[in-house]
Interface confidence: low
């Protein structure tokens, strides 16, 4: 039998048919055991492991009465087989059995889809004793059915290690379609096809799907669930949802936004973290990614000097961590710096350009044309040089550092002198006679000491020699800068 409870699930009568054995006239059971939430029957036995039950199992009692009449087979009486009702309605169903009084400690348990129901349900077992048999009615009620209550319910009774199983009662909870798969937000390439999926279930089946794009239906005819919508491509953002229809009505999925991948917005807030003579550390805040992850960024650097040739240096880096050290820059120079980042669609515009300056560096070249000669009359060594080219000093010249090393048999002694920026000559006292003096000069800026010139050697004789020929930095190609006087 199929019973459909559409508007109201009326409780089923306790007795689906005439019940053998006399009941009390007021139909009040002598014993009633309610099993509310946390249901644990008072006379609980240990059930066998749940398996796929055989419907309507029958136990044949081996005991006879005083008159030696065989007892009838024990079996649950037939009851309603299929109940259909709407979500949130109440339902009550039961199974009943007559058990000879010779059996003690009988109890009925409820099972759903092979699992025993132990809690969160309302089960009542009622006992109606008679002279020879006790009528047992087990009622099961659900006050507000949900989809999860769908399934096959059975009663089980254990007697003398025999298990008696009732016919199943199928509960079918019908309601609005329920989504098992809804469309998901996506970021797609312009004019490129993509798929959206929507799946909904009943009961009741079938469930039909309509697709909606920006509040307008996409398909004229519904498709049976599940439905895959192939969108051939979009040129602008759109919102999609799906409508699921069944006999109970309509459910609408969440609306999902499909974004069109675009070129990213330019980075913002490019700032200088640190400057040295030859490098600048910058950071930036990435712009909007255009719905596609950033792949890498390009730092564009051009000299801010109006006399420069305007060429742009480009440094590529990964998109993270929004930080880059620009190297190989000139000292004491002004630069304009811009940042552009790319995603799979393309490059952003360049960020607003910012101005940055490198600091002073140490000179990059040594003083030129270093000449050393002995002034024996005053027991001094005179040193002369040419200032290094201004462009390559990397900063404002503050002076020079002179290194002079005196070597004679077994003795080596190095001394350092500092001289002011205006000079291009210096005089140092002879430290050791009959020795070689090796002189090297470096230019000095606030950024540091530059490279030393090639060494120039002069021999300082014992007292009494007279010669004023100088030693000097050799011309290019000369292998040995030693001049012995």
């Amino acid at each position: 039998a199929i019973t459909e409870a559409r508007e109201e699930a009326k409780p089923y009568p306790l007795f689906p048919g005439p019940f053998p054995g006399s009941l009390q006239t007021d139909h009040t059971p002598l014993l009633s055991l309610p099993h509310a939430s946390g249901y644990q029957p008072a006379l609980m036995f240990s059930p066998t492991q749940p398996g796929r039950p055989h419907t309507g199992n029958v136990a044949i009692p081996q005991v006879t009465s005083v008159e030696s009449k065989p007892l009838p087979p024990l079996a649950f009486k037939h009851t309603v087989g299929h109940i259909i009702l709407s979500e949130h309605k109440g339902v009550k169903f039961n199974c009943s059995i007559s058990v000879p009084n010779i059996y003690q400690d009988t109890t009925i348990s409820w099972w759903k889809d092979g699992k025993e129901l132990l809690g969160a349900h309302h089960a009542i077992t009622q006992f109606y004793p008679d002279d020879e048999v006790t009528a047992i009615i087990a009622s099961f009620s659900i006050t507000s059915v949900q989809r999860s209550d769908n399934g096959s319910y059975i009663c089980k009774m254990k007697i003398n290690n025999e298990e008696i199983v009732s016919d199943p009662i199928y509960i079918e909870v019908q309601g609005l379609p329920h989504f098992t798969k809804q469309p998901e937000s996506m970021n797609v390439t312009r004019n490129t096809a993509f798929n959206l999926t929507c799946q909904a279930v009943g009961p009741p089946e079938p469930v039909n799907i309509f697709w909606v794009q920006n509040s307008s239906r996409v398909n004229e005819q519904p498709e049976k669930s599940p439905s895959v919508l192939t969108v051939p491509g979009l040129t602008e953002m759109a919102v999609f949802s799906c409508e699921a229809h069944n006999d109970k009505g309509l459910t609408v999925s969440k609306g999902v936004q499909i974004n069109i991948k675009a070129i990213p917005s330019p980075p913002t807030e490019v700032s200088i973290r640190n400057s040295t003579a030859h490098s600048i550390l910058i950071s930036w805040v990435p712009g909007f990614d255009g719905y596609s992850p950033f792949r890498n960024c390009s730092i564009q650097v051009k000299e801010a000097d109006p006399l420069s040739n305007g060429s742009v240096m480009i440094f590529n880096t990964s998109a993270l961590p929004h930080l880059y050290q620009i190297k190989q820059l000139q000292a004491l120079a002004n630069y304009s710096i811009g940042v552009s980042c790319m995603n799979e669609i393309g490059w952003s515009a360049v960020s607003p350009w910012i101005l940055a300056s490198t600091t002073e560096g140490a000179p990059s070249v040594a003083p030129l044309n270093v000449t050393v000669f002995l002034n024996e009359s005053s027991d001094n060594v005179d040193i002369r040089w040419m200032k290094p080219p201004t462009k390559q000093q990397d900063g404002e010249l503050v002076g020079y550092r002179i290194s002079h090393v005196w070597q004679s048999a077994g003795i080596s002694k190095e001394l350092l002198e500092e001289v002011g920026q205006n000079g291009s000559r210096a005089r140092i006292s002879v430290q050791v006679h009959n020795a070689t003096c090796t002189v090297r000069i470096a230019a000095v800026t606030r950024g540091g000491v530059g490279p030393f010139s090639d060494p120039v050697k002069i021999f300082i004789p014992a007292h009494g020699w007279v010669d004023y020929a100088p030693s000097s930095t050799p011309a290019p190609g000369n292998a040995d800068p030693v001049l012995i006087i």
């Epitope: 312009r190 051939p232 491509g233």
Partner: antibody, heavy 120, light 108 residues
Framework: QVQLQQSGPELVKPGASVKLSCKAS????????INWVKQRPGLGLEWIGW????????KYNEKFKGKATLAVDTSSSTASMELHSLTSEDSAVYFC?????????????WGPGTTLTVSS | ENVLTQSPTTVAASPGEKITITCSAS???????LHWYQQKPGFSPKLLIY???NLASGVPARFSGSGSGTSYSLTIGTMEAEDAATYYC?????????FGAGTKLELK
């Protein structure tokens, strides 16, 4: 096989308008942009604009705004371009081309071109 | 707009010769956005190379492309008579889409 067939040559008077057409076949018409490109005798190629047949979305080269109007008829898979207020400067070969947009933009199929002559 | 400058404007080559045509962009473009077309007199342009270095369907392997940033080139490894045509570069990075002025390759 993708094919773009264009309408025949046109001779029109200055100040008039003309409508050129481009019929597509061999692919799903609504999926790709149709672009229009101008080529004057002995000169290079100039992009006029595109139209996306699925919803009529258009993008024009600023230089041709007001000069060209792009349209489509999806039922016949035909794109058209109307040129207004014609002058001798508009005399050229006009190509339609299918735009392939795969994170970039290039023209993978071209029509044979329509020659437009503007002369009194 | 991104102006594409092609050089040389005209080049004459004998069969078997190696030819290189360059295309310089006024703004940086990713290599994904630079494409080359071949046009023979009286015909429509034909896609030759897309995304800087990918040969379009049916294009012989003697054609190749390379480049990055603002500088791109098209090379014909060994010139053949059928390669006499005008070659255009095109950028797809920004609207308006632009073409180079073209390089005419003639047969010596």
């Amino acid at each position: 096989q993708v094919q773009l067939q264009q309408s025949g040559p046109e001779l029109v008077k200055p100040g008039a308008s003309v409508k050129l057409s481009c019929k597509a076949s061999g692919y799903t018409f609504t999926t790709y942009d149709i672009n229009w490109v101008k080529q004057r005798p002995g000169l290079g190629l100039e992009w006029i604009g595109w139209i996306y047949p699925r919803d009529g979305y258009t993008k024009y080269n600023e230089k041709f705004k007001g000069k060209a109007t792009l349209a489509v008829d999806t039922s016949s898979s035909t794109a058209s371009m109307e040129l207004h207020s014609l002058t001798s400067e508009d005399s050229a070969v006009y190509f339609c081309a299918r735009g392939y947009y795969d994170n970039l933009y290039y023209f993978d199929n071209w029509g044979p071109g329509t020659t437009l002559t503007v002369s009194s | 707009e991104n102006v594409l400058t092609q050089s040389p404007t005209t080049v004459a080559a004998s069969p078997g010769e190696k030819i290189t045509i360059t295309c310089s962009a006024s703004s940086i473009i990713s290599s994904n956005y630079l494409h080359w077309y071949q046009q023979k007199p009286g015909f429509s342009p034909k896609l030759l190379i897309y995304r800087t270095s990918n040969l379009a369907s049916g294009v012989p392997a003697r054609f190749s492309g390379s480049g990055s940033g603002t500088s791109y080139s098209l090379t014909i490894g060994t010139m053949e008579a059928e390669d006499a045509a005008t070659y255009y570069c095109q950028q797809g990075r920004s609207v308006p889409l632009t073409f180079g002025a073209g390089t005419k390759l003639e047969l010596k």
